[in-house]
């Protein structure tokens, strides 16, 4: 039996930050779980990991240099990514694993979310007015 995951098909990070919500067909209450976000079609980069149970605070880690945070709902985890670069535009997949109690349970691979990172645009300098006519 696999958990189903729903994600937005596409998100745009206008200010180099984005909230990606992963919604699960499973109630995480009273479970020890590991929610993670993976970058790329092959999910090769583990962007962010959220460890959770309901007796202690969430623990959020990135071992790949991403600036991330996580927020827990009953059947969802929202990843908040900041300081994204334009070249980090890619497809991102949510993963959920119930680590305890056994048996281990994880999700069917989702369709993923394309995160399009828009670069910060500097405000254009005001045009110098032309020579004034007498």
């Amino acid at each position: 039996n696999k958990i189903l995951v729903k994600q937005s098909p596409m998100l745009v990070a206008y200010d180099n930050a984005v909230n990606l919500s992963c919604k699960y067909s499973y109630n995480l209450f009273s479970r020890e779980f590991r929610a993670s976000l993976h970058k790329g079609l092959d999910s090769a980069v583990e962007v962010c990991v959220v460890y959770g149970n309901y007796s202690q605070q969430l623990q959020v880690y990135s071992k790949t240099g991403f600036n991330c945070d996580g927020k827990l709902g009953n059947e969802s985890v929202t990843f908040y990514l900041q300081n994204l670069y334009v070249n980090q535009t890619d497809i991102y997949f949510c993963k959920i694993e119930v680590m305890y109690p056994p048996p281990y349970l994880d999700n069917e691979k989702s369709n993923g979310t394309i995160i399009h990172v828009k670069g910060k645009h500097l405000c254009p300098s005001p045009l110098f007015p032309g020579p004034s006519k007498p």
Epitope: R34, V49, K63, Y104
Partner: nanobody
Framework: EVQLLESGGGWVQPGGSLRLSCAAS????????MAWVRQAPGKGLEWVSV????????YYADSVKGRFTISRDNSKNTLYLQMNSMRAEDTAVYYC?????????WGQGTLVTVSS
């Protein structure tokens, strides 16, 4: 070829300590959660402990909590189980395994005997 090779088993007196190791090869060890599982004589498999792929989170069966510590060194492709305050009921063959729904990779086991 995937290989998990346990070592460190042997005889120990009640209250004693042992450290088991599991050397992994043939797969990307650092991407897998790993577990220790044991089988006491004439009994079924019992899940002992799990550690996640990053080595940041560990989980323990109630029967070993506070006595056993699981750890891993991804740079050495090795999984460990430190067993302290050992009891007769810890006597078993200990296996290391990849921890997922499939439990695809298993070692051949190492025998631990606790008796006086």
């Amino acid at each position: 070829e995937v290989q998990l090779l346990e070592s460190g088993g042997g005889w120990v007196q009640p209250g004693g300590s042992l450290r088991l190791s599991c050397a992994a090869s043939g797969f990307t060890f650092s991407r897998y959660h790993m577990a220790w599982v044991r089988q006491a004589p004439g009994k079924g498999l019992e899940w002992v402990s799990v550690i996640d792929s990053l080595g940041l989170q560990a989980y323990y069966a109630d029967s070993v909590k506070g006595r056993f510590t699981i750890s891993r060194d991804n740079s050495k492709n090795t999984l460990y189980l430190q067993m302290n305050s050992m009891r007769a009921e810890d006597t078993a063959v200990y296996y290391c395994a990849e921890y997922s729904g499939a439990f695809d990779y298993w070692g051949q086991g190492t025998l631990v005997t606790v008796s006086s």
